[in-house]
Interface confidence: low
Protein backbone atom coordinates (compact mmCIF):
# COMPACT_ATOMS: atom_id res chain seq x y z
CA UNK A 1 0.00 0.00 0.00
CA UNK A 2 1.37 3.46 -0.77
CA UNK A 3 3.02 5.65 2.18
CA UNK A 4 0.83 7.78 4.30
CA UNK A 5 1.23 11.28 2.18
CA UNK A 6 -0.15 14.55 4.67
CA UNK A 7 -1.96 17.26 1.98
CA UNK A 8 -1.56 21.10 2.67
CA UNK A 9 -3.18 22.02 -1.01
CA UNK A 10 -3.06 26.01 0.42
CA UNK A 11 0.55 27.56 0.11
CA UNK A 12 -0.58 30.68 1.30
CA UNK A 13 -4.16 31.99 2.82
CA UNK A 14 -4.61 35.36 3.48
CA UNK A 15 -7.22 36.68 6.30
CA UNK A 16 -8.09 39.62 7.66
CA UNK A 17 -8.22 40.53 11.13
CA UNK A 18 -10.93 39.75 13.14
CA UNK A 19 -11.79 37.13 10.66
CA UNK A 20 -12.04 33.28 10.93
CA UNK A 21 -8.76 31.16 8.87
CA UNK A 22 -9.35 27.76 7.44
CA UNK A 23 -6.06 25.61 7.27
CA UNK A 24 -6.52 22.65 5.17
CA UNK A 25 -5.19 19.16 5.34
CA UNK A 26 -5.96 16.05 4.43
CA UNK A 27 -4.23 12.51 4.28
CA UNK A 28 -4.35 9.83 1.56
CA UNK A 29 -4.64 6.79 3.84
CA UNK A 30 -5.83 5.64 7.68
CA UNK A 31 -3.04 4.21 8.33
CA UNK A 32 -0.82 4.59 9.92
CA UNK A 33 -3.03 4.64 12.98
CA UNK A 34 -1.99 7.59 15.39
CA UNK A 35 -3.20 11.60 16.08
CA UNK A 36 -2.65 14.49 13.79
CA UNK A 37 -1.06 17.94 15.03
CA UNK A 38 -1.37 21.50 14.05
CA UNK A 39 1.83 23.45 14.46
CA UNK A 40 3.20 27.03 13.67
CA UNK A 41 6.74 27.18 12.51
CA UNK A 42 9.10 24.42 12.26
CA UNK A 43 11.36 22.35 14.31
CA UNK A 44 11.83 22.57 17.87
CA UNK A 45 10.85 26.20 18.37
CA UNK A 46 7.64 25.35 16.94
CA UNK A 47 4.68 26.01 18.94
CA UNK A 48 0.76 23.30 19.09
CA UNK A 49 -1.76 24.88 17.71
CA UNK A 50 -4.16 22.09 18.11
CA UNK A 51 -3.48 18.68 19.09
CA UNK A 52 -5.91 15.89 18.30
CA UNK A 53 -5.45 13.75 21.01
CA UNK A 54 -5.12 15.52 23.96
CA UNK A 55 -5.35 19.84 24.99
CA UNK A 56 -7.59 22.43 25.23
CA UNK A 57 -7.42 25.02 21.85
CA UNK A 58 -10.53 27.08 22.48
CA UNK A 59 -10.08 29.17 19.13
CA UNK A 60 -9.35 26.13 17.18
CA UNK A 61 -12.52 24.14 15.93
CA UNK A 62 -12.35 21.28 13.38
CA UNK A 63 -14.06 21.19 9.97
CA UNK A 64 -15.09 17.85 10.04
CA UNK A 65 -15.38 14.97 12.86
CA UNK A 66 -12.49 13.67 13.62
CA UNK A 67 -13.96 10.77 15.93
CA UNK A 68 -15.20 9.31 12.88
CA UNK A 69 -13.53 5.79 11.68
CA UNK A 70 -12.39 6.14 8.32
CA UNK A 71 -12.17 10.73 8.67
CA UNK A 72 -8.92 11.69 6.46
CA UNK A 73 -10.07 15.21 6.63
CA UNK A 74 -7.65 17.21 9.29
CA UNK A 75 -8.23 20.86 8.57
CA UNK A 76 -8.80 23.31 10.84
CA UNK A 77 -10.50 26.77 11.42
CA UNK A 78 -8.79 29.27 13.84
CA UNK A 79 -11.34 31.94 15.22
CA UNK A 80 -10.84 35.87 15.35
CA UNK A 81 -7.62 36.02 13.53
CA UNK A 82 -4.91 38.87 14.64
CA UNK A 83 -1.68 39.56 13.31
CA UNK A 84 -0.03 37.72 15.85
CA UNK A 85 -1.49 34.53 14.17
CA UNK A 86 1.00 35.07 11.34
CA UNK A 87 3.10 32.22 10.09
CA UNK A 88 3.70 28.95 8.61
CA UNK A 89 0.72 26.17 9.66
CA UNK A 90 2.12 22.48 9.41
CA UNK A 91 -0.07 19.71 9.55
CA UNK A 92 1.59 16.78 11.17
CA UNK A 93 0.71 13.37 11.51
CA UNK A 94 2.14 10.90 14.50
CA UNK A 95 2.57 7.28 14.66
CA UNK A 96 0.65 5.78 17.62
CA UNK A 97 3.65 4.93 19.88
CA UNK A 98 4.88 3.59 23.43
CA UNK A 99 5.46 5.67 25.25
CA UNK A 100 5.06 8.58 23.42
CA UNK A 101 3.51 8.75 19.78
CA UNK A 102 6.32 9.49 17.30
CA UNK A 103 5.98 12.39 14.26
CA UNK A 104 5.53 10.41 10.74
CA UNK A 105 4.96 12.82 7.93
CA UNK A 106 4.54 16.31 7.66
CA UNK A 107 2.56 18.56 4.87
CA UNK A 108 4.57 21.13 3.06
CA UNK A 109 2.95 24.08 5.67
CA UNK A 110 0.26 26.41 4.88
CA UNK A 111 1.35 30.27 5.37
CA UNK A 112 -0.91 32.51 7.44
CA UNK A 113 -0.92 35.97 6.34
CA UNK A 114 -2.81 38.34 8.43
CA UNK A 115 -4.23 41.87 7.13
CA UNK A 116 -4.90 44.23 9.76
CA UNK A 117 -5.84 47.71 9.23
CA UNK A 118 -3.53 50.66 10.31
CA UNK A 119 -5.19 52.47 13.30
CA UNK A 120 -6.34 55.79 12.22
CA UNK A 121 -3.34 58.34 11.50
CA UNK A 122 -2.33 60.96 14.68
CA UNK A 123 -0.59 64.11 13.41
CA UNK A 124 0.85 66.07 15.83
CA UNK A 125 3.02 69.34 15.52
CA UNK A 126 5.50 71.58 17.13
CA UNK A 127 5.40 72.20 20.95
CA UNK A 128 5.89 76.21 20.47
CA UNK A 129 4.21 78.23 18.00
CA UNK A 130 6.32 79.68 15.05
CA UNK A 131 6.12 82.93 13.18
CA UNK A 132 5.42 83.18 8.83
CA UNK A 133 8.21 82.11 7.05
CA UNK A 134 9.34 79.78 9.57
CA UNK A 135 9.75 75.93 9.20
CA UNK A 136 7.93 73.76 11.64
CA UNK A 137 7.90 69.72 11.44
CA UNK A 138 4.37 67.74 11.75
CA UNK A 139 4.86 63.94 12.65
CA UNK A 140 2.06 61.52 11.76
CA UNK A 141 1.58 57.84 13.45
CA UNK A 142 -0.01 54.81 12.44
CA UNK A 143 0.23 51.80 13.98
CA UNK A 144 -1.18 47.74 13.90
CA UNK A 145 -1.12 47.14 10.05
CA UNK A 146 -0.12 44.45 8.35
CA UNK A 147 0.95 43.77 5.48
CA UNK A 148 3.72 45.95 5.50
CA UNK A 149 3.31 47.99 2.12
CA UNK A 150 1.85 50.80 3.05
CA UNK A 151 1.34 54.57 1.47
CA UNK A 152 1.56 57.94 2.93
CA UNK A 153 1.35 61.43 2.00
CA UNK A 154 1.03 64.61 3.25
CA UNK A 155 -1.35 67.54 2.08
CA UNK A 156 -0.93 71.19 3.01
CA UNK A 157 -4.97 72.81 1.91
CA UNK A 158 -4.88 69.76 -0.48
CA UNK A 159 -1.82 70.54 -2.06
CA UNK A 160 0.56 67.72 -1.68
CA UNK A 161 3.85 68.39 0.27
CA UNK A 162 7.11 66.69 -0.90
CA UNK A 163 9.69 67.42 1.92
CA UNK A 164 9.03 64.40 4.39
CA UNK A 165 10.58 61.28 5.48
CA UNK A 166 8.93 58.44 6.30
CA UNK A 167 9.77 54.95 8.19
CA UNK A 168 7.87 52.06 8.37
CA UNK A 169 8.68 49.54 11.59
CA UNK A 170 10.18 47.39 12.41
CA UNK A 171 12.81 47.08 9.28
CA UNK A 172 12.17 43.37 9.33
CA UNK A 173 9.19 40.73 9.51
CA UNK A 174 6.40 41.37 12.00
CA UNK A 175 3.16 40.63 12.96
CA UNK A 176 2.35 44.09 12.50
CA UNK A 177 4.12 47.61 12.04
CA UNK A 178 4.03 51.00 11.90
CA UNK A 179 4.45 53.79 10.24
CA UNK A 180 6.22 57.32 11.27
CA UNK A 181 6.57 60.06 8.93
CA UNK A 182 7.92 63.71 9.63
CA UNK A 183 6.89 66.27 7.50
CA UNK A 184 8.65 70.16 6.85
CA UNK A 185 5.90 72.73 6.65
CA UNK A 186 6.60 76.78 5.56
CA UNK A 187 4.42 78.70 7.24
CA UNK A 188 2.66 81.77 5.76
CA UNK A 189 0.72 84.98 6.97
CA UNK A 190 -2.62 83.23 5.34
CA UNK A 191 -2.18 79.68 7.01
CA UNK A 192 -4.48 80.30 10.35
CA UNK A 193 -7.21 78.45 8.53
CA UNK A 194 -4.56 75.99 7.13
CA UNK A 195 -4.85 72.05 7.46
CA UNK A 196 -2.17 69.69 7.49
CA UNK A 197 -3.07 66.46 6.49
CA UNK A 198 -1.34 63.05 6.60
CA UNK A 199 -3.17 60.61 4.09
CA UNK A 200 -2.59 56.95 4.55
CA UNK A 201 -3.69 54.28 2.03
CA UNK A 202 -3.28 50.55 2.72
CA UNK A 203 -4.49 47.26 0.92
CA UNK A 204 -7.14 46.50 3.93
CA UNK A 205 -8.86 49.88 3.47
CA UNK A 206 -10.06 49.13 -0.34
CA UNK A 207 -9.26 52.54 -1.49
CA UNK A 208 -10.59 54.97 0.91
CA UNK A 209 -7.84 56.21 2.87
CA UNK A 210 -7.66 57.39 6.58
CA UNK A 211 -6.68 60.56 7.34
CA UNK A 212 -5.55 62.60 10.22
CA UNK A 213 -5.27 66.26 10.44
CA UNK A 214 -3.86 69.20 12.44
CA UNK A 215 -4.95 72.96 12.28
CA UNK A 216 -2.05 75.43 11.32
CA UNK A 217 -4.21 77.80 13.85
CA UNK A 218 -2.55 75.40 16.81
CA UNK A 219 0.64 76.00 15.65
CA UNK A 220 0.91 79.81 14.29
CA UNK A 221 1.82 82.83 15.36
CA UNK A 222 1.29 86.30 13.14
CA UNK A 223 2.97 89.05 14.80
CA UNK A 224 0.80 92.32 14.35
CA UNK A 225 1.53 95.40 12.58
CA UNK A 226 1.39 98.39 15.10
CA UNK A 227 0.47 102.22 13.12
CA UNK A 228 -0.27 105.23 15.66
CA UNK A 229 -2.33 108.16 13.73
CA UNK A 230 -3.47 111.28 15.36
CA UNK A 231 -7.04 112.58 15.33
CA UNK A 232 -8.78 115.50 14.62
CA UNK A 233 -9.31 117.49 17.81
CA UNK A 234 -12.35 116.56 19.71
CA UNK A 235 -12.26 119.35 22.62
CA UNK A 236 -10.19 122.34 23.25
CA UNK A 237 -6.69 121.00 24.52
CA UNK A 238 -7.50 117.21 23.78
CA UNK A 239 -6.12 114.86 21.20
CA UNK A 240 -7.22 111.32 20.21
CA UNK A 241 -4.21 108.77 19.72
CA UNK A 242 -4.97 105.91 17.75
CA UNK A 243 -3.00 102.43 17.52
CA UNK A 244 -4.38 100.08 15.33
CA UNK A 245 -2.58 96.62 16.27
CA UNK A 246 -3.20 94.60 12.74
CA UNK A 247 -3.23 90.99 11.68
CA UNK A 248 -2.15 89.48 14.53
CA UNK A 249 -2.93 85.42 15.81
CA UNK A 250 -3.51 84.02 18.26
CA UNK A 251 -5.68 86.74 20.48
CA UNK A 252 -3.81 86.93 23.14
CA UNK A 253 -2.70 90.32 23.51
CA UNK A 254 -2.17 93.13 25.98
CA UNK A 255 -1.39 96.62 24.68
CA UNK A 256 0.43 99.86 26.80
CA UNK A 257 0.08 103.53 26.09
CA UNK A 258 3.24 105.53 27.32
CA UNK A 259 3.39 109.16 27.35
CA UNK A 260 7.16 110.23 27.51
CA UNK A 261 8.00 106.77 28.74
CA UNK A 262 5.70 106.45 31.57
CA UNK A 263 2.65 103.94 31.81
CA UNK A 264 -0.64 105.88 30.90
CA UNK A 265 -3.05 102.52 30.39
CA UNK A 266 -2.69 98.99 29.78
CA UNK A 267 -5.51 96.97 28.23
CA UNK A 268 -6.26 93.40 26.75
CA UNK A 269 -7.32 92.88 23.23
CA UNK A 270 -10.78 92.20 24.04
CA UNK A 271 -13.63 93.34 20.85
CA UNK A 272 -11.10 92.49 17.93
CA UNK A 273 -12.32 92.09 14.66
CA UNK A 274 -11.62 88.97 12.79
CA UNK A 275 -10.07 88.92 9.28
CA UNK A 276 -11.13 86.86 6.33
CA UNK A 277 -7.91 84.76 6.57
CA UNK A 278 -8.39 84.72 10.59
CA UNK A 279 -6.12 87.09 11.87
CA UNK A 280 -7.29 89.73 14.01
CA UNK A 281 -7.29 93.96 14.27
CA UNK A 282 -7.85 95.97 17.00
CA UNK A 283 -7.96 99.40 17.80
CA UNK A 284 -6.71 101.35 21.09
CA UNK A 285 -6.90 105.17 21.49
CA UNK A 286 -5.95 107.46 23.94
CA UNK A 287 -6.96 110.85 24.94
CA UNK A 288 -4.02 113.48 25.48
CA UNK A 289 -4.71 116.71 27.07
CA UNK A 290 -2.09 118.56 25.86
CA UNK A 291 -2.44 121.33 27.95
CA UNK A 292 -1.12 119.52 31.06
CA UNK A 293 2.22 119.50 29.11
CA UNK A 294 4.72 122.01 28.65
CA UNK A 295 6.67 120.40 26.53
CA UNK A 296 6.29 117.95 23.84
CA UNK A 297 4.88 114.62 24.27
CA UNK A 298 6.14 111.03 23.18
CA UNK A 299 2.86 108.15 23.02
CA UNK A 300 3.95 104.92 22.79
CA UNK A 301 1.72 102.25 21.83
CA UNK A 302 3.23 98.80 23.24
CA UNK A 303 1.92 95.88 22.49
CA UNK A 304 2.89 92.19 23.86
CA UNK A 305 1.86 89.57 21.42
CA UNK A 306 1.10 85.98 22.75
CA UNK A 307 3.94 86.27 25.12
CA UNK A 308 6.33 87.46 23.04
CA UNK A 309 8.90 90.37 23.56
CA UNK A 310 7.41 93.64 23.61
CA UNK A 311 6.71 95.60 19.66
CA UNK A 312 6.41 99.19 20.01
CA UNK A 313 5.70 102.45 17.94
CA UNK A 314 5.90 105.66 18.20
CA UNK A 315 4.15 109.39 17.79
CA UNK A 316 5.84 112.64 18.71
CA UNK A 317 3.11 115.00 19.88
CA UNK A 318 4.16 118.57 19.54
CA UNK A 319 2.81 120.96 22.25
CA UNK A 320 3.64 124.26 20.69
CA UNK A 321 1.86 123.58 17.30
CA UNK A 322 -1.55 123.33 16.34
CA UNK A 323 -3.35 119.38 17.10
CA UNK A 324 -4.65 119.66 13.75
CA UNK A 325 -1.92 120.21 11.74
CA UNK A 326 0.31 116.89 13.54
CA UNK A 327 0.87 114.06 11.00
CA UNK A 328 1.92 110.51 11.73
CA UNK A 329 5.09 109.64 12.67
CA UNK A 330 6.22 106.27 11.07
CA UNK A 331 9.59 105.63 12.80
CA UNK A 332 9.40 102.54 14.60
CA UNK A 333 10.78 101.92 17.66
CA UNK A 334 11.43 98.06 18.49
CA UNK A 335 11.93 97.12 22.22
CA UNK A 336 12.01 93.56 21.37
CA UNK A 337 15.33 91.68 21.10
CA UNK A 338 13.91 88.42 18.86
CA UNK A 339 11.20 90.63 16.78
CA UNK A 340 12.37 92.72 13.72
CA UNK A 341 10.84 96.41 13.31
CA UNK A 342 7.07 96.46 12.23
CA UNK A 343 6.23 99.16 9.62
CA UNK B 1 19.42 25.74 25.21
CA UNK B 2 20.39 27.50 21.95
CA UNK B 3 23.88 27.88 21.45
CA UNK B 4 26.11 29.47 18.86
CA UNK B 5 29.05 28.48 17.58
CA UNK B 6 31.42 30.08 14.95
CA UNK B 7 33.72 28.52 13.13
CA UNK B 8 36.29 29.55 9.94
CA UNK B 9 40.27 30.79 9.61
CA UNK B 10 42.05 32.05 12.36
CA UNK B 11 44.25 33.36 9.87
CA UNK B 12 43.30 35.67 6.80
CA UNK B 13 45.99 37.31 4.45
CA UNK B 14 45.89 40.86 3.55
CA UNK B 15 43.22 41.73 0.84
CA UNK B 16 41.63 38.35 1.05
CA UNK B 17 38.13 37.21 2.49
CA UNK B 18 37.09 36.54 5.80
CA UNK B 19 34.61 33.81 6.11
CA UNK B 20 32.83 32.29 9.02
CA UNK B 21 30.25 30.57 10.10
CA UNK B 22 28.13 30.15 12.53
CA UNK B 23 25.89 27.29 13.39
CA UNK B 24 22.68 27.62 15.35
CA UNK B 25 21.76 24.29 17.67
CA UNK B 26 18.69 23.90 19.99
CA UNK B 27 16.78 26.34 19.21
CA UNK B 28 15.07 27.38 15.59
CA UNK B 29 15.96 30.25 13.43
CA UNK B 30 13.00 31.70 12.77
CA UNK B 31 11.68 35.06 14.50
CA UNK B 32 15.00 36.45 15.42
CA UNK B 33 17.53 38.38 13.87
CA UNK B 34 20.89 36.26 13.72
CA UNK B 35 24.17 38.84 14.39
CA UNK B 36 27.67 39.29 13.81
CA UNK B 37 29.75 41.70 15.79
CA UNK B 38 33.22 42.03 16.31
CA UNK B 39 36.27 43.56 19.13
CA UNK B 40 39.37 44.05 18.35
CA UNK B 41 42.37 43.62 20.91
CA UNK B 42 41.83 45.84 23.68
CA UNK B 43 38.68 47.38 22.05
CA UNK B 44 35.01 47.74 22.35
CA UNK B 45 32.50 45.96 20.44
CA UNK B 46 31.17 46.80 16.74
CA UNK B 47 28.00 45.61 15.59
CA UNK B 48 28.75 44.27 11.61
CA UNK B 49 25.36 43.62 10.65
CA UNK B 50 22.67 41.05 10.99
CA UNK B 51 20.15 39.38 9.06
CA UNK B 52 16.61 38.21 9.58
CA UNK B 53 15.29 35.15 9.15
CA UNK B 54 12.97 35.74 6.15
CA UNK B 55 16.78 36.69 4.32
CA UNK B 56 16.70 40.48 4.76
CA UNK B 57 20.18 41.95 5.59
CA UNK B 58 21.02 44.91 7.27
CA UNK B 59 24.86 46.24 7.83
CA UNK B 60 26.99 48.91 9.43
CA UNK B 61 27.27 51.45 6.93
CA UNK B 62 31.24 51.54 7.39
CA UNK B 63 31.63 47.89 6.58
CA UNK B 64 28.63 47.65 4.37
CA UNK B 65 30.40 47.77 0.92
CA UNK B 66 32.90 44.67 2.04
CA UNK B 67 30.14 42.49 3.92
CA UNK B 68 27.72 39.59 3.37
CA UNK B 69 25.95 37.78 5.53
CA UNK B 70 23.98 35.03 4.17
CA UNK B 71 21.54 32.34 5.56
CA UNK B 72 20.42 28.43 5.24
CA UNK B 73 17.67 27.70 7.26
CA UNK B 74 17.83 23.69 5.90
CA UNK B 75 22.01 23.71 8.20
CA UNK B 76 20.54 26.11 10.97
CA UNK B 77 23.57 28.24 9.83
CA UNK B 78 24.34 31.86 8.98
CA UNK B 79 27.49 33.20 7.83
CA UNK B 80 29.70 36.28 7.06
CA UNK B 81 32.05 37.24 4.17
CA UNK B 82 34.18 40.22 4.77
CA UNK B 83 36.37 41.29 1.73
CA UNK B 84 39.84 43.12 0.99
CA UNK B 85 40.64 42.73 4.73
CA UNK B 86 43.49 44.83 6.38
CA UNK B 87 45.18 44.36 9.63
CA UNK B 88 42.62 46.39 11.29
CA UNK B 89 39.95 44.16 10.86
CA UNK B 90 41.77 41.69 13.36
CA UNK B 91 39.56 41.11 15.66
CA UNK B 92 37.83 38.36 17.90
CA UNK B 93 34.07 38.10 15.76
CA UNK B 94 31.00 36.75 17.98
CA UNK B 95 27.98 35.45 16.16
CA UNK B 96 24.75 36.43 18.29
CA UNK B 97 20.68 36.18 18.26
CA UNK B 98 19.03 39.36 18.95
CA UNK B 99 15.38 39.37 19.87
CA UNK B 100 12.87 41.02 18.34
CA UNK B 101 9.08 41.03 19.60
CA UNK B 102 8.06 44.49 20.91
CA UNK B 103 7.49 46.50 17.44
CA UNK B 104 10.15 48.83 16.25
CA UNK B 105 13.11 47.96 18.25
CA UNK B 106 15.46 45.01 19.43
CA UNK B 107 15.29 42.76 22.83
CA UNK B 108 18.42 42.04 23.51
CA UNK B 109 21.05 40.24 22.19
CA UNK B 110 20.38 37.18 24.77
CA UNK B 111 22.48 34.17 23.10
CA UNK B 112 26.47 35.06 21.99
CA UNK B 113 28.37 32.63 20.56
CA UNK B 114 32.22 32.01 22.46
CA UNK B 115 34.10 34.14 19.60
CA UNK B 116 36.85 33.16 17.16
CA UNK B 117 39.93 34.83 16.95
CA UNK B 118 40.69 36.44 13.10
CA UNK B 119 44.02 37.36 12.69
CA UNK B 120 44.91 39.18 9.59
CA UNK B 121 48.55 39.26 8.67
CA UNK B 122 50.97 38.23 5.90
CA UNK C 1 24.48 56.95 13.65
CA UNK C 2 22.82 56.83 17.55
CA UNK C 3 26.38 57.73 19.08
CA UNK C 4 26.73 56.05 23.13
CA UNK C 5 28.41 57.64 25.19
CA UNK C 6 29.34 55.79 28.88
CA UNK C 7 30.97 56.87 31.89
CA UNK C 8 33.24 56.44 34.17
CA UNK C 9 35.91 54.95 31.73
CA UNK C 10 36.75 52.75 35.03
CA UNK C 11 35.09 52.09 38.65
CA UNK C 12 37.05 50.51 41.12
CA UNK C 13 34.16 48.68 43.51
CA UNK C 14 34.39 47.46 46.98
CA UNK C 15 32.02 44.03 47.20
CA UNK C 16 28.78 44.55 48.80
CA UNK C 17 28.63 48.10 47.67
CA UNK C 18 26.59 49.95 45.38
CA UNK C 19 27.86 51.01 41.98
CA UNK C 20 26.34 53.21 39.31
CA UNK C 21 27.27 53.37 35.33
CA UNK C 22 25.77 56.28 33.14
CA UNK C 23 25.07 55.84 29.48
CA UNK C 24 24.11 58.64 27.09
CA UNK C 25 22.88 58.53 23.60
CA UNK C 26 22.83 61.14 20.92
CA UNK C 27 19.58 61.06 20.47
CA UNK C 28 16.59 59.93 22.03
CA UNK C 29 15.91 56.03 22.48
CA UNK C 30 12.28 56.08 23.37
CA UNK C 31 9.61 55.20 20.52
CA UNK C 32 6.06 56.36 20.53
CA UNK C 33 5.22 53.16 21.99
CA UNK C 34 6.88 53.31 25.23
CA UNK C 35 9.92 51.40 24.64
CA UNK C 36 13.40 52.65 25.16
CA UNK C 37 15.83 49.98 23.17
CA UNK C 38 18.37 50.27 25.70
CA UNK C 39 20.27 47.27 26.57
CA UNK C 40 23.43 46.60 28.69
CA UNK C 41 25.83 44.12 28.82
CA UNK C 42 28.37 42.17 31.07
CA UNK C 43 31.90 41.08 29.40
CA UNK C 44 34.06 39.01 31.78
CA UNK C 45 37.14 38.62 31.24
CA UNK C 46 38.03 36.60 28.18
CA UNK C 47 34.23 35.75 28.29
CA UNK C 48 31.45 36.86 25.41
CA UNK C 49 29.15 39.31 26.13
CA UNK C 50 26.37 38.91 28.49
CA UNK C 51 22.65 40.39 28.29
CA UNK C 52 21.65 41.97 31.61
CA UNK C 53 18.86 44.50 30.79
CA UNK C 54 17.08 45.31 27.95
CA UNK C 55 14.29 47.82 26.68
CA UNK C 56 16.16 50.12 29.32
CA UNK C 57 15.03 48.00 32.58
CA UNK C 58 13.76 44.91 31.76
CA UNK C 59 15.39 42.24 33.20
CA UNK C 60 17.09 39.59 31.02
CA UNK C 61 16.42 35.95 31.92
CA UNK C 62 18.83 34.59 34.89
CA UNK C 63 20.31 38.18 35.14
CA UNK C 64 20.53 38.65 39.60
CA UNK C 65 18.00 41.47 40.88
CA UNK C 66 21.29 43.24 41.61
CA UNK C 67 21.08 44.39 38.63
CA UNK C 68 18.87 46.78 37.57
CA UNK C 69 18.53 49.56 34.82
CA UNK C 70 16.47 52.70 34.83
CA UNK C 71 16.32 56.12 32.65
CA UNK C 72 14.47 56.79 29.68
CA UNK C 73 15.38 59.08 26.37
CA UNK C 74 19.21 59.93 26.24
CA UNK C 75 20.22 59.36 29.79
CA UNK C 76 20.32 56.15 31.11
CA UNK C 77 22.03 54.14 34.07
CA UNK C 78 22.82 50.81 35.33
CA UNK C 79 22.97 50.05 38.87
CA UNK C 80 24.33 47.44 41.02
CA UNK C 81 23.08 47.26 44.69
CA UNK C 82 25.29 45.15 46.19
CA UNK C 83 28.62 44.38 43.90
CA UNK C 84 29.71 40.81 43.92
CA UNK C 85 33.51 39.87 42.85
CA UNK C 86 32.06 37.88 39.77
CA UNK C 87 30.67 41.65 38.62
CA UNK C 88 33.64 42.33 37.44
CA UNK C 89 34.17 43.04 33.69
CA UNK C 90 33.49 45.73 31.28
CA UNK C 91 29.62 46.84 30.94
CA UNK C 92 28.90 48.09 27.71
CA UNK C 93 25.30 49.87 26.98
CA UNK C 94 23.78 49.39 23.14
CA UNK C 95 21.28 50.86 21.37
CA UNK C 96 18.85 48.77 19.68
CA UNK C 97 16.30 51.57 18.40
CA UNK C 98 18.24 51.57 15.11
CA UNK C 99 20.67 50.04 12.68
CA UNK C 100 23.32 50.21 12.92
CA UNK C 101 23.06 49.30 16.73
CA UNK C 102 25.97 51.01 18.53
CA UNK C 103 27.73 50.58 21.96
CA UNK C 104 29.01 53.12 24.43
CA UNK C 105 32.79 52.59 24.76
CA UNK C 106 32.75 50.33 27.95
CA UNK C 107 32.99 50.78 31.85
CA UNK C 108 35.62 48.96 33.47
CA UNK C 109 34.67 47.73 36.77
CA UNK C 110 37.21 46.36 39.16
CA UNK C 111 37.61 45.49 42.39
CA UNK C 112 39.80 47.97 44.94
Known amino acids: EEELQVIQPDKSVLVAAGETATLRCTATSLIPVGPIQWFRGAGPGRELIYNQKEGHFPRVTTVSDLTKRNNMDFSIRIGNITPADAGTYYCVKFRKGSPDDVEFKSGAGTELSVRAKPSAPVVSGPAARATPQHTVSFTCESHGFSPRDITLKWFKNGNELSDFQTNVDPVGESVSYSIHSTAKVVLTREDVHSQVICEVAHVTLQGDPLRGTANLSETIRVPPTLEVTQQPVRAENQVNVTCQVRKFYPQRLQLTWLENGNVSRTETASTVTENKDGTYNWMSWLLVNVSAHRDDVKLTCQVEHDGQPAVSKSHDLKVSAHPKEQGSNTAAENTGSNERNIY | QVQLQESGPGLVRPSETLSLTCTVS????????WSWIRQPPGKGLEWIGF???????FYNPSLKSRVTISLDTSKNQFSLKMTSVTAADTAVYYC????????????????WGQGTTVTVSS | DIVMTQSPLSLPVTPGEPASISCKSSQSLLYSNGYAYLDWYLQRPGQSPQLLIYQGSNRASGVPDRFSGSGSGTDFTLKISRVEAEDVGVFYC?????????FGGGTKVEIK
Open chain 2, 26 to 33: GGSIRNYY
Open chain 3, 94 to 102: MQALQTPLT
Open chain 2, 96 to 111: ARVRAYSGIGLDGTDV
Open chain 2, 51 to 57: IYYNGRT
